[in-house]
């Protein structure tokens, strides 16, 4: 944020650039928080807009038991790697195809015992306030899929009739980790000494981190045709005076009629 | 990348043999898996017959065992199907696959490599 600054008063404004802010031979630049020719008022909002999307990622594990482990396998550039990988990605697709969340797998490692497979499940959701709630439902259809098919498609005989087979007691879940955004937190954060006055209400299931000087949310206070200024003690309106009246109180809204002061000073001399 | 030239096909009496081959080039390993799959008019297409390269294992449908010998030539890196007393029931288009993985499948969708199909017609 930035103002910019004319004529002779400006080498006395360098000085005086307020809150960190930093002069550029023109004007005073602003720290994010704030704004002005002296960066000496508080912005009334601030940007947290959320990531588009929130990211989940399963480490689990599987043992393949229609392919023969090769020490070619560990190798990832080895044909037989590419291969393998190519298969087991297209078989989980199938796995997970119903699960809107999915976005893939990635194999992290494979050893030996028929074949281990060590994979991660890629899972993606748009941001919305209930991300966590949609995270872990996808996360638990992933359980239930990966149990189903490691149960169903398994060794007849020594032979598989599916694309791929399973060990029914190899498959694990290590470990779930989910991005994690905590609107209200990086709110605070960012509002630095002002946190205790900043909220996140939103709109169209988008956060803002507004205080209570930005019009148009419930937290708004109304300072009627005052200005709403944040301090360190929390917001407050600032009133005006106009060519006939002064006004008063804590958000402007008593206003007194300057011709009866006016006249009643007169009356007094 | 792996590339599959199938041959041998023809027509021929029930009772009677044919030999199929299949070239395969493109492999940077000695240790894979090779197959014979077939496809009927009108039907899904169906392994006949599987092996490793190594010598490890060989598969063989109910349908054909006893009847027909899968085999492999490392030096020559082709593959072979030897078909005896043959049925009219073996008509179909003979397809050979392969994989660099040591597959213990008999479903297509896990084999990526295919060769065209060559027709074999047992017909009096």
């Known amino acids: 944020r930035t103002t910019t600054c004319f004529g002779d008063g400006c080498q006395n404004t360098a000085s005086r650039c307020k809150n960190g802010g930093t002069w550029d031979g023109l004007k005073c630049q602003c720290p994010n928080l704030y704004y002005g020719e002296l960066c000496e008022e508080v912005v009334s909002s601030i940007d947290i807009g959320p990531p588009e999307t929130i990211s989940a990622q399963m480490e689990l594990t599987v043992t393949v038991t229609s392919v023969k482990f090769t020490e070619e396998l560990k190798n990832h550039s080895s044909q037989e790697f590419q291969e393998f990988k190519q298969t087991f990605t297209e078989q989980m697709n199938i796995v997970y195809s119903g699960i809107p969340e999915y976005v893939g797998v990635n194999i992290t490692k494979l050893r030996l015992g028929s074949v281990v497979v060590e994979h991660d499940v890629l899972l993606r959701t748009k941001y919305t306030p209930e991300y966590k709630t949609v995270l872990d439902n996808a996360t638990e259809v992933v359980k239930e899929k990966i149990t189903k098919v490691t149960t169903q498609q398994i060794m007849i005989n020594d032979i598989c009739s599916d694309m791929m087979c399973f060990n029914t007691t190899g498959t694990q879940v290590q470990n779930i980790t989910v991005t994690q955004y905590d609107p209200e937190e990086d709110c605070r954060k960012m509002a630095k000494e002002y946190g205790d006055y900043f909220v996140v209400e939103y709109r169209d299931q988008k956060p803002y981190c507004i205080s209570p000087c930005e019009p148009g949310f419930s937290v708004s206070k109304n300072c009627n045709l005052g200005k709403c200024q944040m301090s360190l003690s929390g917001p407050q309106c600032l009133c005006v005076t106009t060519e006939t009246h002064w006004y008063s109180g804590e958000t402007c809204n008593q206003g007194t009629q300057k011709s009866l002061v006016y006249g009643h000073h007169h009356h007094h001399h | 990348d792996v590339q599959l030239q199938a041959s041998g096909g023809g027509v021929v009496q029930p009772g009677g043999s044919l030999r199929l081959s299949c070239a395969a080039s493109?492999?940077?390993?000695?240790?894979?898996?090779m197959a014979w799959f077939r496809q009927a008019p009108g039907k899904e297409r169906e392994v006949v017959a599987f092996?490793?390269?190594?010598?490890?294992?060989?598969y063989y449908a109910d349908s054909v065992k006893g009847r027909f010998t899968i085999s492999h030539d490392n030096s020559k890196n082709t593959l072979y199907l030897q078909m005896n007393s043959l049925r009219a029931e073996d008509t179909a288009v003979y397809y050979c696959?392969?994989?660099?993985?040591?597959?213990?499948?008999?479903?297509?969708?896990?084999?990526?490599?295919w060769g065209q199909g060559t027709m074999v017609t047992v017909s009096s």
């Open positions: 092996i490793w390269t190594d010598g490890g294992r060989t």
């Open positions: 696959a392969a994989s660099s993985l040591l597959l213990q499948t008999i479903n297509p969708r896990a084999w990526p490599y």
């Open positions: 493109g492999y940077t390993s000695n240790r894979y898996s």
